[in-house]
């Protein structure tokens, strides 16, 4: 476990940007930032979840543009943006920073939000390292920021996977000097394979060397791609500014341990020397005689270093070496917020009040005891009951995030933008309101007809 920290230093027009602020003089505004972390270095869809976490800054100071003045850097919110992560720090990640403007005028619809800039960077970063600085351009804007990942005790290490505990304080007897200052003593971490990279490798079992994403080889010293351009191909990359040598899956020789690389359509194949195997020859020749199967797993094959072994795992364990305990609770078998208990030989669900059954599937209460999450309201009818969920939530108890724009909430042709706190409607000309509900001049030509022919006031009118 640990925290990713982001410090925004400045946000304003970049060199050669607009001479006057593109912030537009619509009255008082303030900035805020959203940070989103995704694991890995792949180009993920913009709407894919922030699997490593997300955070929202406070609002910055109110800012009113002077129409003719050159645009300065805009006033920023105070403090760090912090994204806690629960599991190991992956080492490679995608960082997305969005700069939002909140207009504070007494304009129709209350505060209006608009996305000013969005930058996406794919980075490698070890936890516990120093602050890394960056400058990014997005259109006419320039964003300067620093970031780091740090572990939270008792976790330590570049991936926050080693656990530490404070050494117990010895008590001083009467008349004795104060004891030596408290020191930190780490639980003996697993002894990794000799030579395993301290920077790019880690182990959870003795004798192993597991690599952070982007590194390979038996000792995690071989980058998956030797290009600093993170796999981008072509004459040059506008995002990194670096030149990538010609295309080809064997560039930089991805085969470790002296393996030779041959190209296949759209991929590559490694021919490994004796004693190594795996996609990139990264696995050393372990045999069943080495006892590679943990937790009582049965080893089959692998009589000599040239042949692979297979571990047949006992119930409750998985992984190529039976090293992982199956977390049967991760499938969330207990319904209605029940607490899952994996007893090893069986699963138990401890149900919330008002629910019963092996998986808490029976609802004993009506709306009187029913909780609809996230602002949902309970609706009774015909002996049954259900949750009517607030915008942006769905599911039986309104616990599931729904696409807030799926219900087409913006009226009169307004455009819907999904937003961290719900949605934002950008209204068509002539309409106002949080959901564009109000035609400014319902009888004018700019709006849809307020009362189509044949309808009297008080009659309904439908809009697509």
């Amino acid at each position: 476990a640990g925290v990713f920290e982001l410090q925004i230093h400045s946000f304003g027009p970049g060199p050669g940007g607009a001479p006057r602020s593109p912030y537009s003089a619509r009255g008082p505004c303030r900035l805020f930032f959203r940070v989103c972390l995704k694991p890995g270095l792949s180009e993920e869809a913009a709407e894919s979840p922030c699997a490593l976490g997300a955070a929202l800054s406070a609002r910055g100071p109110v800012y009113t543009e002077q129409p003719e003045a050159p645009a300065p850097d805009l006033p920023l919110p105070n403090g760090l943006l912090q994204v806690p992560f629960r599991d190991a720090w992956p080492g490679t990640f995608s960082l997305i920073i969005e700069t939002w403007r909140e207009e504070l005028g007494d304009q129709i619809g209350g505060p209006a939000w608009s996305l000013l800039a969005r930058v996406t960077r794919r980075r490698r970063l070890a936890a516990g390292g120093p602050w890394a600085g960056d400058i990014q351009r997005a259109g006419a804007w320039e964003l300067r920021f620093s970031y780091r990942a740090r572990c939270e005790l008792p976790a330590v290490g570049t991936a926050c996977t080693r656990l530490c505990r404070p050494r117990s304080a010895s008590r001083c007897g009467p008349g004795l000097r104060p004891c030596a200052p408290l020191e930190d003593e780490c639980e003996a971490p697993p002894v990794c394979r000799a030579g395993c990279s301290l920077e790019h490798g880690f182990c959870e079992q003795p004798g192993e060397c597991r690599c952070l994403e982007g590194w390979t080889g038996p000792l995690c010293m071989v980058p998956v791609s030797t290009s600093s351009c993170l796999g981008l191909r072509g004459p040059s990359s506008t995002t990194t500014g670096c030149l990538v040598p010609g295309p080809g899956p064997c560039d930089g020789n991805p085969c470790a341990n002296g393996g030779s690389c041959s190209e296949t359509p759209g991929s590559f194949e490694c021919t490994c020397p004796r004693g190594f195997y795996g996609l990139r020859c990264e696995v050393s020749g372990v045999t069943c005689a080495d006892g590679p199967c943990f937790n009582g797993g049965l080893c089959v094959g692998g009589a000599d270093p040239d042949s692979a072994y297979i571990c047949h795992c006992p119930p409750g364990f998985q992984g190529s070496n039976c090293e992982k305990r199956v977390d049967r609770c991760s499938l969330q078998p207990c319904r209605n917020g029940g607490l899952c208990l994996d007893l090893g030989h069986a699963l138990r669900c401890r149900c919330r009040a008002g629910f019963a059954g092996p998986r808490c599937e029976h609802d004993l209460n009506d709306c009187a005891g029913r909780a609809c999450a996230n602002g949902g309201t309970c609706v009774e009818g015909g002996g049954a009951h259900r949750c009517s969920c607030a915008l942006g939530f769905g599911g039986r108890d309104c616990r599931e995030r729904a696409d807030p724009c799926a219900a087409r909430p913006c009226a009169h042709g307004g455009r819907c933008y999904a937003h961290f706190s719900g949605l934002v409607c950008a209204c068509a000309p002539g309409y106002m309101g949080a959901r564009c509900e109000f035609p400014v001049h319902p009888d004018g030509v700019s709006a849809l007809p307020a009362a189509p022919p044949g309808l009297r006031p008080g009659d309904p009118q439908r809009y697509p």
């Epitope: 619809g109 209350g110 505060p111 309201t377 009517s388 915008l391 219900a407 087409r408 909430p409 009226a411 009169h412 309101g433 949080a434 959901r435 509900e437 109000f438 319902p442 307020a450 008080g458 009659d459 309904p460 009118q461 439908r462 809009y463």
Partner: nanobody, 119 residues
């Protein structure tokens, strides 16, 4: 089907106050908005104030600081408190109700109530 009934209009002197009320009967939805519009003699109907289902409010520049819109969800009602009335506020005031049901939007208008500001 939703019907809107306005009340509270009348004659008032400049500088005086009035409160307009509008009740929606029928089957109002939880995702809705209420508004007040007015049509002055010889002019087209214009938005005065509106309140969305999330409680956010909108006002036209000409009434900001003088008029206040509010709603009572339990009573399916919306109110317009009008202070510091001026002669140019004389108009027929219409209640407006907008709702979204299953992705289909519908709007409703009341019959209007006359507000006359005159000494």
């Amino acid at each position: 089907e939703v019907q809107l009934v306005e009340s509270g209009g009348g004659l008032v002197q400049p500088g005086g106050s009035l409160t307009l009320s509008c009740v929606a009967s029928g089957s109002p939805s939880s995702i809705n908005a209420y508004g007040w519009y007015r049509r002055a003699p010889g002019k087209q109907r214009e938005l005065v104030a509106g309140i969305s289902s999330d409680g956010s409010k909108v006002y036209s520049d000409s009434v900001k600081g003088r008029f206040t819109i509010s709603r009572d969800n339990a009573k399916n009602s919306v109110y317009l408190q009008m202070n510091s009335l001026r002669a140019e506020d004389t108009a027929v005031y219409y209640c407006y109700y907008f709702r979204t049901v299953s992705g289909s939007s519908m709007s409703y208008w009341g019959q209007g109530t006359l507000v006359t500001v005159s000494s």
